[in-house]
Interface confidence: low
Amino acid sequence: VMVGTGVAAQNGILIKGGKPLEMAHKIKTVMFDKTGTITHGVPRVMRVLLLGDVATLPLRKVLAVVGTAEASSEHPLGVAVTKYCKEELGTETLGYCTDFQAVPGCGIGCKVSNVEGILAHSERPLSAPASHLNEAGSLPAEKDAVPQTFSVLIGNREWLRRNGLTISSDVSDAMTDHEMKGQTAILVAIDGVLCGMIAIADAVKQEAALAVHTLQSMGVDVVLITGDNRKTARAIATQVGINKVFAEVLPSHKVAKVQELQNKGKKVAMVGDGVNDSPALAQADMGVAIGTGTDVAIEAADVVLIRNDLLDVVASIHLSKRTVRRIR
């Protein structure tokens, strides 16, 4: 066992003792979390589509409000949106966010204020003569601008519907276009008005398809689990060759999905980065944490892939088989 774990460690696979090493070769199902595991977990905003009255809510204002709201989110998609908004607005400073609530698997809601400063220090529109610029090279703030507070909702269709908004078929179709490419489409409502759609893409890891194919050729069932909607999940699964998908799974229900498979007599390995999936890593017969994941995940897992390479999932099972064969 010590030799096996030592060899694993030399190859960037940290196996916490003999028990997981002996368990690995019994694994019949590997469940991969999507974001940060099958994908890089570094999402990028691909498109911002304004849906409302652009006179009332021009793009710049929407980005200032959305960037401020998402700055309080720890979700990778929220981080990506805030990064994009800051870059687009040419600022590191955002407004104030209060009454923030995040509903896992659905979206966020909050109140946003103090975005006037961001909008005042915008880049000069082409139509603005240079003589109107202040020393900072930006347009002066409007005099007597009344500070506004915006009520913001950002999330999936279900989240907005739950908050009383109607999503028209053309908006839903625009979202579907992106979801069919494996992108995540989220909606933005400000002060009760649906005003934008943001499409976010997260690239699939280069080795993911090979890792999935190799596991399947070893007789292991491979499952994708994600909080994303079915269309996005299915598109990503197709890219890497996974047939079985659990989509729209709330973080709290990921454990139940692992138990569901265990109750059918299967030995389950759960592979994740710890964002929303630490309890599932702990529940699995073998919890595998990606090394770039959270401290909680690394604590909860039986195996840690230091190199963040999905082929190391395959390697750990191979190593387990060889070690157990030696022991016997």
Partner: antibody
Framework: SLEESGGRLVTPGGSLTVTCTVS????????IIWVRQAPGEGLEWIGS?????SAYYTSWVKGRFTISKTSTTVDLKMTGLTTEDTATYFC?????????????WGQGTLVTVSS | QVLTQTPSPVSAAVGGTVTINCQSS????????LSWFQQKPGQRPKLLIY???TLASGVPSRFKGSGSGTQFTLTISDVQCDDAATYYC???????????FGGGTEVVVK
């Protein structure tokens, strides 16, 4: 203003870097786009370099072209060149989020790929 | 985003009016992120219209942009010999996976 440089004759399979040098404005406030135009053809977007250095590319680039920037220049590095890459390469300035159009253009630099 | 321009080429008499259409699929960002350029042979493109309808600095008022969402039009009235060029519409580049430029419309002045 913007000025492209570095265009020349290259053999197929070769590499080349063309440079866009800017003056009179800050790259930390604007996007720079690269556009090419094959002889007798239309304008074709290659990619964009953002204020914080992020780069976006068109779908056909497939890793052959890379955009990088310094405080006053934006480079377009091209590898695996083919005769189809023969074109005049332009850089242009694009605004921030409240506008997305290209108000300043360089004069272009000609890249010829031929054996 | 795909921008389709029609017609090409288009001819006009001096003093006449020319209309060039640009159709976007899907709609352009902000419903107005569309610009028009003029390019003469051997020269760099020149911005004429931005924000679908705003005239760029120094551009004669004979050039007029209109439209919103998916349908846009550039109208050149009182056409001059100097207007002979290829005209391009363009959408936003940051949301483009494909080319944000239309295919171009050549205007021939008789």
């Amino acid at each position: 203003s913007l000025e492209e440089s570095g265009g020349r004759l290259v053999t197929p399979g070769g590499s080349l870097t063309v440079t866009c040098t800017v003056s009179g404005f800050s790259l930390s406030s604007y996007w720079i786009i690269w556009v090419r135009q094959a002889p007798g053809e239309g304008l074709e977007w290659i990619g964009s370099s953002g204020p914080s250095g992020s780069a976006y590319y068109t779908s056909w680039v497939k890793g052959r072209f890379t955009i990088s920037k310094t405080s006053t220049t934006v480079d377009l590095k091209m590898t695996g060149l083919t005769t189809e890459d023969t074109a005049t390469y332009f850089c242009a300035r694009a605004g921030g989020s409240d506008y997305d159009w290209f108000d300043l253009w360089g004069q272009g630099t000609l890249v010829t790929v031929s054996s | 985003q795909v921008l389709t321009q029609t017609p090409s080429p288009v001819s006009a008499a001096v003093g006449g009016t020319v209309t060039i259409n640009c159709q976007s699929s899907p709609s352009v960002a902000n419903n107005n992120w569309l610009s028009w350029f003029q390019q003469k042979p051997g020269q760099r493109p020149k911005l004429l219209i931005y924000g679908a309808s705003t005239l760029a600095s120094g551009v004669p008022s004979r050039f007029k942009g209109s439209g919103s969402g998916t349908q846009f039009t550039l109208t050149i009235s009182d056409v001059q010999c100097d207007d002979a060029a290829t005209y391009y519409c363009a959408g936003g580049h940051k949301t483009a996976e494909k080319n944000p430029f239309g295919g171009g419309t050549e205007v021939v002045v008789k």
